[in-house]
Amino acid sequence: IIPVEEENPDFWNRQAAEALGAAKKLQPAQTAAKNLIIFLGDGMGVSTVTAARILKGQKKDKLGPETFLAMDRFPYVALSKTYSVDKHVPDSGATATAYLCGVKGNFQTIGLSAAARFNQCNTTRGNEVISVMNRAKKAGKSVGVVTTTRVQHASPAGAYAHTVNRNWYSDADVPASARQEGCQDIATQLISNMDIDVILGGGRKYMFPMGTPDPEYPDDYSQGGTRLDGKNLVQEWLAKHQGARYVWNRTELLQASLDPSVTHLMGLFEPGDMKYEIHRDSTLDPSLMEMTEAALLLLSRNPRGFFLFVEGGRIDHGHHESRAYRALTETIMFDDAIERAGQLTSEEDTLSLVTADHSHVFSFGGYPLRGSSIFGLAPGKARDRKAYTVLLYGNGPGYVLKDGARPDVTESESGSPEYRQQSAVPLDGETHAGEDVAVFARGPQAHLVHGVQEQTFIAHVMAFAACLEPYTACDLAPRAGTTD
Amino acid sequence: IIPVEEENPDFWNRQAAEALGAAKKLQPAQTAAKNLIIFLGDGMGVSTVTAARILKGQKKDKLGPETFLAMDRFPYVALSKTYSVDKHVPDSGATATAYLCGVKGNFQTIGLSAAARFNQCNTTRGNEVISVMNRAKKAGKSVGVVTTTRVQHASPAGAYAHTVNRNWYSDADVPASARQEGCQDIATQLISNMDIDVILGGGRKYMFPMGTPDPEYPDDYSQGGTRLDGKNLVQEWLAKHQGARYVWNRTELLQASLDPSVTHLMGLFEPGDMKYEIHRDSTLDPSLMEMTEAALLLLSRNPRGFFLFVEGGRIDHGHHESRAYRALTETIMFDDAIERAGQLTSEEDTLSLVTADHSHVFSFGGYPLRGSSIFGLAPGKARDRKAYTVLLYGNGPGYVLKDGARPDVTESESGSPEYRQQSAVPLDGETHAGEDVAVFARGPQAHLVHGVQEQTFIAHVMAFAACLEPYTACDLAPRAGTTD
């Protein structure tokens, strides 16, 4: 498919001249950021961004790659080096420590320097590092965490927790020896480490005692509370704040977000991770865009500003399953949330960053025709005389041998939301990838986001832009009209 | 391996504070660029950049990812959308048209708008688009093309040629019907379309009549001249310029680059593509770094400045073979050339861009330990109880079934320069990938390189920065001390 207008050199020359004009107009703001938003696409490497752009464009009846994601409109881009101190290819715990606390840690640890060792409780104390969200709170800002995963998952936990094991969601997941040594589960830390104004995502079961039925799935024992200590953490959290509200479904969320008496909001919409966007019950569960909007409504009441973490956390899960359909539709919802946040905030006073914690071994090749489905087949056949998809994985569960051979695939099969793209190496779960990821920036001090940086730089840019520790002497003018 | 100093949060906080300090000091230059250099890593997607960084670092006895490539030091980064008008995943011809001429074209065409159709000679005329190199020449600058491929290959040809088929290297490759219609082979266009001051790379055989023995392989008929028209294009080129010199080996190149009487230099060091850096005979063939240095010595004599295209063209070839060792060692030599050019030029007057034309379906995963070989094995075994490498391809010739199963691999095998990493789909040649690639920029107007852009933007930034057509009214101050 060749669009007629694109055959004319004028089309490209005009477009580039406009882009140049926009580039020339870019003026680095010398003001401080009142608000900070970090959008974290978990596992959203550059190949995921491009494939999602094409898919989002095609959903709007365009050919695809010529369209813009919301994040594409951010004026500044850097590359972020994602390795952890101990691994070339990191996990979401060590990376969360980097972009939220400004310090690199070890694989599967959270909120701890690399002096801490995975799973060794006694290496926790003294090695805690403090997140930018925590520092924002200390500076009088309101703070929030929004995710499509459990709110106790590795990425959001980087904003508030310190743990040598990212899997210690509730005390039931913590070995008795570690509990005796004083190591706390992540859910406990969620409500006790700091005062978080807005908490939205999944993860109900980690907050309630074993045997507590889940409100949405009351007959499913596996979905009920998991805690061994008998604590109802939601109740404890509600008791801390007069204006606190707990919600567990979309209707309650929308009501609470518009209620001026609500000062603190916890919404936990699933026992574990939230459902994939394509599986979401839109009556019961809010979308990431809706959660983001709700969070912004509450947080933006604070005249001192806010810090908000928004995670598209299940992009990563789709990739681990080698189901690109899931990963890419999650990325589109993540981008929709970015777009909505842009409408609800001003780049005059809000520094917004979009990035990924790491990438995936996910590729998009095979010379497909422009406008062809991103989930489709490459032109021609492979060496084994069978069709193959343009999307593939280096490793993962999409490896199937039928009669000692690679299975053939049709366009209809590959377009299915359940289809697992093939991989070179058979694994139960496809792995992360170690290449640099993009950082997109907009707003005050966004111009500092440049070049190739360590992932830790992200936290430092946020802290500096908002004059938080250790950059309180930031020497940035407050935005005209900022109230305190 | 956990470096002790990295266990201390101060290590990361200090490092990030320094990076912030550097970011704050960045001042967009308001001057024009006297010189333009575009470094093109053919097939150098972000995964290739990261893997090469680790390899280069490890060759210097470091752990790897914490080190810097020369391109990493460039202060500005953008992402470039590489699709061609007709394909989601492009080739090196259509992309060369984009980044060198500023207009997108169709797959496998060069220097033509998308109104031209692949292989249809009669769609050439009237659809030619003019490269920035050509415009630089018209503005009185010296110009050069340096590549490790044939100088008639798709990427360098984008600087001077217009052809509906990138494979028309010499007239022997052009169908008789197309020749009768007036379509010229790329080698002919190299010497006749415009005056190029420096031409360095491979591609001897396309310049000489059939039956002309090659000077390096005189007894090898397959390496000799291929031309059917009986023309000696080197002789024709030499006759055009009094100070022209032709060289075919490293010794002659080094002599010619230091000879003030040489105004034009053509060096063709292999009959076809130059040898991979790991196979190069260092007595006979210059490295990419040496060719770059030679080009800069000649071009920098012009007080009006120069345009130079430098291509690490065989990164792409290594990937097509699914031989990451070759691709990554080519990338390192490419980076060495960037480093050397940086030493020989000033960012006060030289805009340097580094980018790729497209990526490859190449991934780096599997959670390897920090400091482990980039060519090594992932920890643990796959689901088939066999080892697997951290580097893998989505498709390509590394797919082998032994007895109906994926072959096992040892660290020693995977570290071999000949080893082909495994792929999900068996192809004769691994394919390009369609995700965005990075653009690194340094020098006057480098700050314009920002955000997510069409690949065409690159040509326009160069033209604008040097006040070339269509931006002669660029309104940029010449650099203090610029001579004309």
Partner: antibody, heavy 123, light 106 residues
């Protein structure tokens, strides 16, 4: 002109050791992969060992039948290639050739060969 | 490791005959196959590399073809001086020779 000259062959008892040498001239020795190949009486050609070039760190590879017994090495200052053969067996009796690779079409074909040196393992 | 199966092991033909020798690899060798001529008391001589490229000085009656796992050496018109043993060599991944084909005149 590329020249390869093997030496060091001769009669040796089983279980003993022998070192073969190959002197190279006419090319930049450090830039090329070098191999040893043998041909036993009445048998076919058998590739034994490879040592790569400077650019690839002079890494080595062996065929399974000689791994652990034979060692390939090079002295670049002398333009010399060596094959150290330990624990020799009667089946190691063969003409041993030194060969240089050429990188045609990015392959590493064994393009240049010496004339060979005979090794006889017998008690 | 890649195995090479060469056939036939010996072959008797008349002068002027078309002669074909085949080599089958245990896996795809991506056209990285060479053919050598070996005459007793001499070093093996490279005749063809990368499947079909003739070495300098090799008569044009020799040709090579193939792809994937299957490769062929053809002598279009056998000459007396062609009497020798021919070996294929894969060099895609390290090196493996075929068992050889002894060519004789009838």
């Amino acid at each position: 002109e590329v020249q390869l000259v093997e030496s060091g062959g001769g009669l040796v008892q089983p279980g003993r050791s022998l070192r073969l040498s190959c002197t190279a001239s006419g090319f930049t020795f450090t830039d090329y992969y070098m191999s040893w190949v043998r041909q036993a009486p009445g048998k076919g050609l058998e590739w034994l060992a490879l040592i790569r070039n400077k650019a690839t760190g002079y890494t080595t590879e062996y065929t399974a039948s000689v791994k652990g017994r034979f060692t390939i090495s090079r002295d670049n200052s002398k333009n010399s290639l060596y094959l150290q053969m330990n624990s020799l067996k009667t089946e190691d009796t063969a003409v041993y050739y030194c060969a240089r690779a050429s990188f045609y079409y990015d392959g590493k074909v064994l393009a240049y060969w010496g004339q060979g040196t005979l090794v006889t393992v017998s008690s | 490791d890649t195995q090479m199966t060469q056939s036939p092991s010996s072959l008797s033909a008349s002068v002027g005959d078309r002669v074909t020798i085949t080599c089958k690899a245990s896996q795809d060798i991506n056209k990285y196959i060479a053919w050598f001529q070996y005459k007793t008391g001499k070093a093996p001589k490279l005749f063809i590399h990368y499947t079909s490229t003739l070495q300098p000085g090799v008569p044009s009656r020799f040709s090579g073809s193939g792809s994937g796992r299957d490769y062929t050496l053809t002598i279009s018109s056998l000459q007396p001086e062609d009497i020798a043993t021919y070996y294929c060599l894969q060099y895609d991944n390290l090196y493996t020779f075929g068992q050889g084909t002894k060519l004789e005149i009838k």
